[in-house]
């Protein structure tokens, strides 16, 4: 499928993730830029969409070695670089952050640095009360954490 | 299917200041992030500046620091660049540039408008 | 930022041949954790703005005629015309999104 096809919402997580520009303002503009901060913000912001990649690669290998995705050819498509559909959908469902953010913590800090800086932002999100906890009878799935706990004691390139 | 329009060039004075505009069609324009990519007669291409979907995120490139703003209006499906305190450098075309799902990556590009900068 | 290397600035290939583009990046644009490479190539033909040819490396974008490959990884890319025909005569571009979007300066091909 092509990049073109796509509806879906090409978003980010939220803007205190990446310390953004949020103000049109002038001044404050030059302000950020006489500090060095312009690109390297951007940087930031983009360091966040990849960590939102690997979680959607993350979340199609679960599905998959389930058997349970409904369009069981996602994360075969993705590996090849032709999956890019609903991509955003996945992402933006609350209640699958929250299982990511679970998923994700187990993973280690110094394994994935820019995972685990999402993850500890979507924590604060949920500690203010803005997930869902429509996952709760996934997370209670003992089949579904037996899975997981194999998929993250795996090295990735041991799964590709 | 996707149609992104510039306008807003032409040939102004160093220190002057223009505003483009990029009206978009075709796709759900507030649903994406969009880039502003220019391109010196005869050079190369060199990336300006992004807004995310929702104008929330704005980033720019060390070459246009403090003196190019980037904006949208959703209701509008209309990008916008004000370019301020113009040098010769700024000379380019200027594209707007849909952004594919994967960030930085440019599925659609404007046919450009030429930003003419000379005393 | 990453500062991307193209060679070289121009070749001449008869119509048929293969034309072969090479792209470095100063720094790796492999993302280990899902073992993507975000790199880009681009095609502009005189008057025209840029079109988007493979992304990920070497996913040819929709629509993009199979004789188009791209390879590569980390650091060293690869864009591959086989058979070039009349109509791939364009400047074309790499460029790496993993960090701020820089592009290399541009490889003119033209018939021989």
């Known amino acids: 499928r092509s990049l073109q096809d796509t509806e879906e919402k090409s978003r980010s997580f939220s803007a205190s993730q990446a310390d953004p520009l949020s103000d049109p303002d002038q001044m404050n503009e030059d302000k950020r830029h006489s500090q060095g901060t312009f690109t390297s913000d951007y940087s930031k912001y983009l360091d966040s969409r990849r960590a939102q990649d690997f979680v959607q690669w993350l979340m199609n290998t679960k599905r998959n070695r389930n058997n349970i995705a409904k369009r069981h050819d996602e994360f075969e498509r993705h590996a090849e670089g032709t999956f890019t559909s609903d991509v955003s959908s996945y992402l933006e469902g609350q209640a699958a952050k929250e299982f990511i953010a679970w998923l994700v913590k187990g993973r280690g800090r110094r394994d994935f640095p820019e995972e685990v800086a999402i993850v500890e932002e979507l924590g604060r999100r949920h500690a203010d009360g803005s997930f869902s906890d429509e996952m709760n009878t996934i997370l209670d799935n003992l089949a579904a954490r037996d899975f997981i706990n194999w998929l993250i004691q795996t090295k990735i390139t041991d799964r590709k | 299917q996707v149609q992104l329009v510039e306008s807003g060039g032409g040939v102004v004075q160093p220190g002057r200041s223009l505003r483009l505009s990029c009206a978009a069609s075709g796709f759900a324009f507030s649903n994406y992030g969009m880039h502003w990519v220019r391109q010196a007669p005869g050079k190369g291409l060199e990336w300006v500046t992004f807004?995310?979907?929702?104008?929330?995120?704005?980033y720019y490139a060390d070459s246009v620091k403090g003196r190019f703003t980037i904006s949208r209006d959703n209701s509008k499906n209309t990008l916008y660049l004000q370019v301020n305190s113009l040098r010769a450098e700024d000379t380019a075309v200027y594209y707007c540039a849909k952004e594919a799902v994967l960030a930085a990556l440019f599925d659609y590009w404007g046919q450009g408008t030429l930003v003419t900068v000379s005393s | 930022d990453i500062v991307m290397t193209q060679s070289p600035d121009s070749l001449a290939v008869s119509l048929g041949e293969r034309a072969t583009i090479n792209c470095k990046s100063s720094?790796?644009?492999?993302?280990?954790?899902?073992?993507?490479?975000?790199l880009a190539w681009y095609q502009q033909k005189p008057g025209q703005p840029p079109k988007l040819l493979i992304y990920w490396a070497s996913t040819r974008e929709s629509g993009v005629p199979d004789r188009f490959s791209g390879s590569g990884s980390g650091t060293d890319f690869t864009l591959t015309i086989n058979s070039l025909q009349a109509e791939d005569v364009a400047v074309y571009y790499c460029q790496q999104y993993y960090s701020t979007p820089t592009f290399g300066q541009g490889t003119k091909v033209e018939i021989k």
């Open positions: 720094q790796s644009v492999l993302y280990s954790s899902n073992n993507q490479n975000y």
């Open positions: 807004i995310s979907y929702d104008g929330s995120n704005k």
